[in-house]
């Protein structure tokens, strides 16, 4: 009963003349444990007997013997673990046929059939490629033999082409009850070049014996395969020249569907064979053309072929670094004139002079001059030769105003008071003067650009200076405008004594002045409108009180002449001429009032006053007026007075007083 | 005709300050593309550029002393000068002052010389 | 930066020979360069010029030649007030001056 029985093996097992077969096998019986084991070599069922018939292999009696002759098969199994492996070494060519297992329990019974295919010589692994094998993406080639055996080591080797392939391979063996197999698994990366080439799978022995082979053609899907080709086969050419190109396909698999023609990238319109074919060829026409072929694996672009078209160099145009230039700053002119191949020499002009020694495409003036200003033109020079002279490029050259100077437009001399015209002039300027400045700043005219009106003219206005400005500002180096004047600051100043004058004294007095312009001059003394010296000093051996008053001291130069202010000059002296004198007379009629009044001339003034009688005997009295009231007849007689100031004494000579009678005196004697 | 004429201490201790003066007569350092250079030269050796002032104020300088290095002009005076700081005894030199006239291009050269003044550095 | 780089450091010539001296410079200088001569305890003096152009005064057994980085100063006939140093210089290299050429009477 089938149900019963649940055994399970490869079904086929394969081999060759002298090799080996190793069966996997286990069972599972329902009831009871198996009690014997028969291995049949094609076994029949004899319906009479109803028993199997056959050769029998190996028998598992009690003993456990084999028949004799069967020492070749070997039960590997057991009935404890229910395996049933078994093993034929070596195995011949008639061992093909069924197998039989006969299985027999306590109540079951079982003929389980494993087909054994053994041929002559060994058969050939099997080559496994994936459906699709495209350039570059990588894929794993199967080589698989359905035969392994414990007893007779294999290899598989892979060749491409007849050449061991450097790839490593994993080898794997099976032998398990669902499959016995041997398998090589290589991971591969088809390129193009691999497309019709014949990959095998050797199948080697122990000794490494080729025992048998496959093999399989590859189909390598790829691109197309480019080589391009120019004809004349110089890719560099010269203007008007006629060049082909032709866009060779060395392999595509499918064949190639569409062509076209690329320059520097972008497609070139109607250009769809694999000829491209340049008549007359122009500078525009330089450049990197390829071709690209497209297949249903892709597109595939030619190698890059730089085609150059040499031209002489065009007309040149300069190109400055900076224009307008200010003076002193760095300039660089570049010479631009397109040529191929490149110029190997240039020729700079400057205002159509060339320019020694400057050779190169790029010409740098370090520090720029004005003189440097003007139009800058190059020559360019190759191996087809010397370019067209562009027209030039201008290079303006800023710089302050140069060589400032001043000039004063007057007759000279100049005299204070005068109107003085001053111009700001200079050689060369650019940009053109805008405007002016002038040293020291004052409410002055410019009555035109550059022009400076000083009016009435002061006697300080020594230097002026002015700068003519554009972007810059340039300074002239100061005028000095030397303004003739009359002498200034006169003024009278006693040089000796140092203190107060005296009486006696020996005075000086000096005419001072600040400055005059010119310097020579002329004094003159005056006192009241008297002249009294023409010296710069004006001297008194012995100063007396007359000669004080008001003294002026003038200096004059070529231009006119200045007074000093009025200067006092004070003499101090004693009391003098001191004389005594009576308002109402020198005789007084008694009981009258009579006043003695000591007149003097000193200076300082007097401040004491003394006075004395005929016997010089001080009176009692200290004013300048001596009053007598009611003056009596007794009080006749001579008088003086004593005056006292600072410097000293000085006293009156004698008066005489007459006192006479009243009437009523007389009257009464 | 032109005349230039260094002036300076003759002797200086290390780490002192030199302060050269050029007295210049015969031509204007307001003129385009007038320099003065200052150029020394140590005995028995070759000479050495210092530094250049230009009309303009520019001042170029010895990239290998430019730290210790002032050069300054004033125009009115015609004079230029030089400064160098913490000088030393490899400093002992004969130091000139040139003219470079004005180029025709950037062609600088110097067509005066000073006579030169000699400076002793002791340590 | 542009170097000068004169050679000979010395030489050695007597009177009535001619010398040459020469100058490289490690970039196109476009002729800007110029020669001195220095005499014993004396200040050098201009001889040359913008590669060719001989100084004011300068007697004309002196010459200048060359280009872009080679320049030579040729003395012929050399004179007893020949012998001394001799500079070339390039103001816009660093340094501008060349290391000298020392030529002495032989």
């Known amino acids: 009963d089938s149900s019963k029985w649940n055994i399970e093996h490869p079904g086929t097992i394969y081999a060759w003349e002298g090799a080996c077969v190793w069966v996997p096998c286990t069972y599972r019986v329902l009831d009871g444990a198996l009690e014997t084991f028969i291995l049949f070599h094609n076994p029949e069922y004899n319906q009479n007997m109803s028993k199997f018939e056959g050769t029998r292999l190996y028998e598992s009696t009690k003993d456990g013997k084999v028949p004799s002759g069967q020492k070749r098969v070997q039960f590997l199994g057991n009935k404890i673990n229910n395996n049933c492996t078994l093993s034929i070494h070596p195995v011949h060519v008639n061992d093909s046929g069924q197998l039989g297992l006969r299985m027999v329990s306590k109540t079951e019974k079982w003929m389980e059939r494993i087909h054994l295919n053994v041929s002559e010589r060994p058969f050939p692994p099997r080559i496994q490629l994936p459906p699709k094998l495209q350039e570059s993406q990588e894929v794993t080639l199967t080589c698989l033999l359905n035969f392994s055996c414990y007893g007779y080591q294999i290899q598989l080797q892979w060749l491409l082409e007849g050449v061991p392939m450097r790839q490593a391979a994993v080898t794997s063996t099976s032998l398990s009850t669902k499959s016995v197999f041997t398998r090589s698994e290589l991971k591969f990366s088809p390129q193009w070049s691999h497309h019709g080439k014949i990959v095998t799978c050797e199948l080697h022995d122990v000794d490494g014996k080729v025992l048998s082979e496959d093999m399989v053609q590859l189909n390598v899907k790829h691109t197309p395969k480019l080589t391009i080709e120019v004809t004349p086969n110089e890719t560099i050419v010269r203007k008007g020249d006629s060049v082909t190109m032709t866009c060779k396909v060395n392999s595509s698999n499918p064949e190639y569907t569409t062509v076209s023609w690329l320059k520097d990238g972008i497609p070139l319109k109607e250009q769809n064979t694999l000829m491209l074919t340049l008549h007359e060829v122009t500078k525009s026409q330089t450049g990197r053309y390829c071709c690209r072929v497209s297949n249903d694996v892709g597109p595939a672009t030619s190698e890059k072929v730089f085609l150059q078209v040499q031209y002489a160099p065009e007309p040149s145009r300069v190109q400055i670094s900076q224009s307008p230039a200010v003076e002193g700053s760095e300039v660089n002119f570049l010479c631009i004139s397109p040529a191929n191949p490149l110029p190997t020499n240039y020729t700079w002009y400057h205002n159509g002079k060339e320019v020694q020694g400057r050779t190169e495409k790029q010409f740098q003036i370090q520090k720029i001059l004005p003189w440097h200003a003007g139009t800058y033109s190059c020559e360019a020079e190759n191996i087809l030769g010397i370019g067209e002279r562009g027209p030039g490029t201008e290079l303006d050259v800023q710089y302050p105003p140069k060589k400032v100077t001043m000039v004063i437009e007057n007759p000279t001399p100049i005299r204070e008071g005068d109107t003085v015209t001053l111009s700001c002039n200079y050689s060369s300027s650019n940009p053109i003067v805008n405007h002016y400045e002038w040293r020291p700043r004052g409410a002055w005219e410019e009555p035109s650009l550059g022009v400076l009106k000083i009016q009435n003219i002061g006697w300080n206005n020594t230097a002026v200076a002015c700068a003519a400005c554009n972007n810059w500002c340039s300074w002239a180096s100061p005028v000095t405008l030397n303004v003739l004047y009359a002498p200034r600051g006169v003024r009278v100043r006693k040089i000796k004594p140092l203190s107060e004058i005296h009486s006696g004294n020996s005075v000086s007095l000096q005419c001072d002045f600040s400055s005059s312009h010119p310097k020579e001059v002329q004094f003159f003394w005056e006192k009241n409108g008297s002249l009294l010296g023409k010296e710069s000093q004006l001297n008194f051996d012995s100063i007396s009180p007359e000669d004080a008053g008001s003294y002026s001291c003038w200096v004059n130069n070529s231009i006119g002449q200045t007074a000093s202010k009025a200067w006092t000059l004070e003499v101090l002296y004693a009391p003098r001429r001191l004389r005594v004198s009576m308002s109402q007379g020198n005789q007084v009629m008694e009981g009258k009032t009579a006043t003695l009044t000591c007149e003097s001339d000193a200076n300082p003034p007097v401040y004491s006053y003394a006075w004395f009688d005929w016997n010089n005997q001080s009176l009692p009295y200290s004013g300048r007026m001596l009053r007598l009231e009611p003056v009596k007849v007794q009080h006749s007689g001579a008088y003086w007075c004593q005056g006292t100031n600072r410097v000293g004494k000085g006293h009156s000579p004698l008066i005489t007083l007459t006192v006479y009678y009243s009437p009523q005196t007389i009257g009464r004697r | 005709q032109v005349t230039l004429k260094e002036s300076g201490p003759g002797i200086l201790q290390s780490s002192q300050t030199l302060s050269l003066t050029c007295s210049f007569s015969g031509f204007s350092l307001s003129t385009s593309g007038m320099g003065v250079s200052w150029i020394r030269q140590p005995s028995g050796k070759g000479l050495e550029w210092l530094a250049h002032?230009?009309?303009?104020?520019?001042?170029r300088y010895n990239p290998s002393l430019k730290s210790r290095l002032t050069i300054s002009k004033d125009t009115s005076r015609n004079q230029v000068f030089l400064k160098i700081t913490s000088v030393d005894t490899a400093d002992t030199a004969t130091y000139y002052c040139?003219?470079?006239?004005?180029?025709?291009?950037?062609?600088?050269?110097?067509?005066?010389w000073g006579q030169g003044t000699t400076l002793t550095v002791s340590s | 930066d542009i170097q000068m780089t004169q050679s000979p450091a010395s030489l050695s010539a007597s009177v009535g020979e001619t010398v040459t001296i020469t100058c490289r410079a490690s970039g196109n200088i476009h002729n800007s360069l110029a020669w001195y001569q220095q005499k014993q305890g004396k200040s050098p003096q201009l001889l040359v010029h913008n590669a060719k152009t001989l100084a004011d005064g300068v007697p004309s057994r002196f010459s200048g030649s060359g280009s872009g980085t080679q320049y030579s100063l040729k003395i012929n006939s050399l004179q007893p007030e020949d012998f001394g140093s001799y500079y070339c210089q390039h103001f816009w290299s660093t340094p501008p001056f060349g290391g000298g050429t020392k030529l002495e009477i032989k």
């Open positions: 040139a003219r470079a006239p004005p180029p025709n291009w950037d062609e600088y050269y110097f067509d005066y």
């Open positions: 002032i230009y009309w303009d104020d520019d001042k």
